[in-house]
Every structure is written in structure tokens, then in C-alpha cells.
């Protein structure tokens, strides 16, 4: 769920998601449209696709709570939960490390980006 994602992103990137990523660009945060603005925004667009796939599979992406361990900079998703819980953790782990990989190109000007400026084709999943 959202609490899992926030905690994981903070642990992996060292940034407070609510201040740094939700929202950011055209796809980080709720919703998303248009062409992603940069690599960080692409992380979020890919994550949206991951969530969309789980939604089609009947998973409650915002409610399902999963367990994971964070140790020595790595995330280990618990294999104890339901199928949805395990897949949700995998989606969140991927976006957390994607955001970390792209910290060097993070642009403060894209924080709280005005969504009506998000134009162009929204990438398919």
C-alpha cells in the first residue's frame, strides 16, 4: 500500500517522498498523463503500469499491506504474503531503486509540476 511505498522510497533514496516525489513531473504522485519529463518521471510512469497490471489482476494496490526487510541498502520482499502482496512489493521495490538510480538527474523545478503542461502521447504499458 501507500504507506509501504512511502517508507521504501525514503529508505532507498534518502528523500522524503511527500516533499520530493509526490508529486514530481507528469507521473509521480496520483494519476499521470503525457510524456514523462525525465528519467525520474519515467520511473513513476513504469510504476503506474506495474500497478495497472496488478489492478487488472484484482489486487487492492492501495490497501494491500506487504512485509519486507531493508538491510545494507537492499530490499528483500517477504515471500510470506499472498500473491498480490508479493507482486506489489516487487513493483514498489523496482520504482524505489529506479528513483535512486536517477537521483543525479533529479530536477527541483519538476517538483509540483503543473499537470496541464503535461502534453504529448502518454506512453503505453
Amino acid at each position: 500500500g501507500i504507506l509501504n511505498l512511502n517508507k521504501m522510497v525514503k529508505q532507498v533514496t534518502g528523500k522524503m517522498p511527500i516533499l520530493s516525489y509526490w508529486p514530481y513531473g507528469c507521473h509521480c504522485g496520483l494519476g499521470g498523463r503525457g510524456q514523462p519529463k525525465d528519467a525520474t518521471d519515467w520511473c513513476c510512469q513504469t510504476h503506474d503500469c506495474c500497478y495497472d497490471h496488478l489492478k487488472t489482476q484484482g489486487c487492492s494496490i492501495y490497501k494491500d499491506y506487504y512485509r519486507y526487510n531493508f538491510s545494507q541498502g537492499n530490499i528483500h520482499c517477504s515471500d510470506k504474503g499472498s500473491w498480490c502482496e508479493q507482486q506489489l512489493c516487487a513493483c514498489d521495490k523496482e520504482v524505489a531503486f529506479c528513483l535512486k538510480r536517477n537521483l543525479d538527474t533529479y530536477q527541483k523545478r519538476l517538483r509540483f509540476y503543473w499537470r496541464p503542461h503535461c502534453r504529448g502521447q502518454t506512453p503505453g504499458c
Epitope: C59, D79, K80, W83
Partner: antibody, heavy 120, light 106 residues
Framework: QVTLKESGPGILQSSQTLSLTCSFS??????????VSWIRQPSGKGLEWLAH???????RYNPSLKSRLTISKDTSRNQVFLKITSVDTADSATYYC????????????WGQGTTLTVSS | QIVLTQSPAIMSASPGEKVTISCSAS?????MYWYQQKPGSSPKRWIY???KLASGVPARFSGSGSGTSYSLTISSMEAEDAATYYC?????????FGSGTKLEIK
């Protein structure tokens, strides 16, 4: 060869506490990924999952019964226990323990079951 | 929680007849699992990951489905197949079972 065997009191009065034991062999609950569930089946009816305990002592309960259930284990004796408080006639059923490995989403080995009758 | 509805509740089939048992989920699931239970015995894992047969299960059994609709099929009914069959999901917590389909031999 994996085997599980349940034992219990057979008969209880309403409001008493049910204590069940599952004794197993052929696997160890100290092995990562291993777990044991309790599942019950009222006579002539379907199956209801109750609780699960993992190798690392993590536990899961059926939300509809959570307040009445306690699952525990004795790894060295290869046993898993289930307690159900304040039993009622609706708890009359055959109780099974079953093994589930975390990487699978089904129960691969089941015990023979132990029958509980609750009298009012 | 996900509710699994099996149909029919009871059915009878003649030897050699094709049998299909259905399991409908209240919301989409990724995989379905099936168990066979005979009177006085515990359930046995029968079909896993929707379509894979457990060890020792005859090849006349098959499983299929996706989303909310799954089924177990026996291509040619035999007397030893008379039993109750249960579907089960652990797509989302908690794991749940269907109400069962009792299959009798004519």
C-alpha cells in the same frame, strides 16, 4: 515422507477453550519458507482457513476469527498448536493442519483431521 | 475477502462421460488450486497453478481458466473420481475455498 496428525479433546462445552495439537514429520519448521496452517470443516460443509504460522514465528489469522485464535509452535518437537477461545456449537467441525511452503499458494500436505463437537 | 462460488453443488456422471466443475471468483485471481476429498478423508492437492496436475493425478483431469472463471475437467469419468472437489485461492489475503462440488457416479 511428510505426515501431519492432529489431536484434540473431541468434545467441549460451550464457552470453553479449544486446544489443538498438530504433530508432523518429514519437514522442519526451522527451514526457511516452511509454514503450517489450521483449516476446519463443519460436517457436510466447506473448508475454512483459520491461521498460519511461519518458520520465523510470524503468524497470520483469518480476520473474521482473529480475536479468538492463537497459533504457536514448538520447533524442536515438530508441533504446532491452535487455541480457540469461547467455543460455540458453530465451532463443531473437523480441524485439519496442513503444510504450506511460502513460495507456493496452496496446501500440499494435510493431516487426517480431528473432530470437535461442542455441546451447549 | 474473495468469495469462490462453485457450480454445480452436486452432480452425477456416468462412466466415460466428460465432467466440468466451475469455480467463480468474486474478483479476479491469478491462479486457482483444486483439492479432491473423499468421505472420511482429508483433502488432497489435485491441481495447482490453475492447470498443473499434482503427482499421482490421472491425466484425464485438467484445469483451466483466468480472471474470475476457472474450471476442473475430467475427460472421461471413472468410478474412482467420485468425490468432492474444492477450489482455493491465495491471490489475496485471506486464503479462501469454494463451497465444494460433490461428484457422484451414476
Amino acid at each position: 515422507q511428510v505426515t501431519l496428525k492432529e489431536s484434540g479433546p473431541g468434545i467441549l462445552q460451550s464457552s470453553q477453550t479449544l486446544s489443538l495439537t498438530c504433530s508432523f514429520s518429514g519437514f522442519s519448521l526451522s527451514t526457511s519458507g516452511m509454514g503450517v496452517s489450521w483449516i476446519r470443516q463443519p460436517s457436510g460443509k466447506g473448508l475454512e482457513w483459520l491461521a498460519h504460522i511461519y518458520w520465523d514465528d510470524d503468524k497470520r489469522y483469518n480476520p473474521s476469527l482473529k480475536s479468538r485464535l492463537t497459533i504457536s509452535k514448538d520447533t524442536s518437537r515438530n508441533q504446532v498448536f491452535l487455541k480457540i477461545t469461547s467455543v460455540d456449537t458453530a465451532d463443531s467441525a473437523t480441524y485439519y493442519c496442513a503444510r504450506r511452503e511460502s513460495k507456493y499458494f496452496y496446501f500440499d500436505y494435510w493431516g487426517q483431521g480431528t473432530t470437535l463437537t461442542v455441546s451447549s | 475477502q474473495i468469495v469462490l462460488t462453485q457450480s454445480p453443488a452436486i452432480m452425477s456422471a456416468s462412466p466415460g462421460e466428460k465432467v466440468t466443475i466451475s469455480c467463480s471468483a468474486s474478483s479476479s485471481v491469478s491462479y486457482m488450486y483444486w483439492y479432491q476429498q473423499k468421505p472420511g478423508s482429508s483433502p488432497k492437492r489435485w491441481i495447482y497453478d490453475t492447470s498443473k496436475l499434482a503427482s499421482g493425478v490421472p491425466a484425464r483431469f485438467s484445469g483451466s481458466g483466468s480472471g474470475t472463471s476457472y474450471s476442473l475437467t475430467i475427460s472421461s469419468m471413472e468410478a474412482e473420481d467420485a468425490a468432492t472437489y474444492y477450489c482455493q485461492q491465495y491471490h489475496s489475503y485471506p486464503p479462501t475455498f469454494g463451497s465444494g462440488t460433490k461428484l457422484e457416479i451414476k
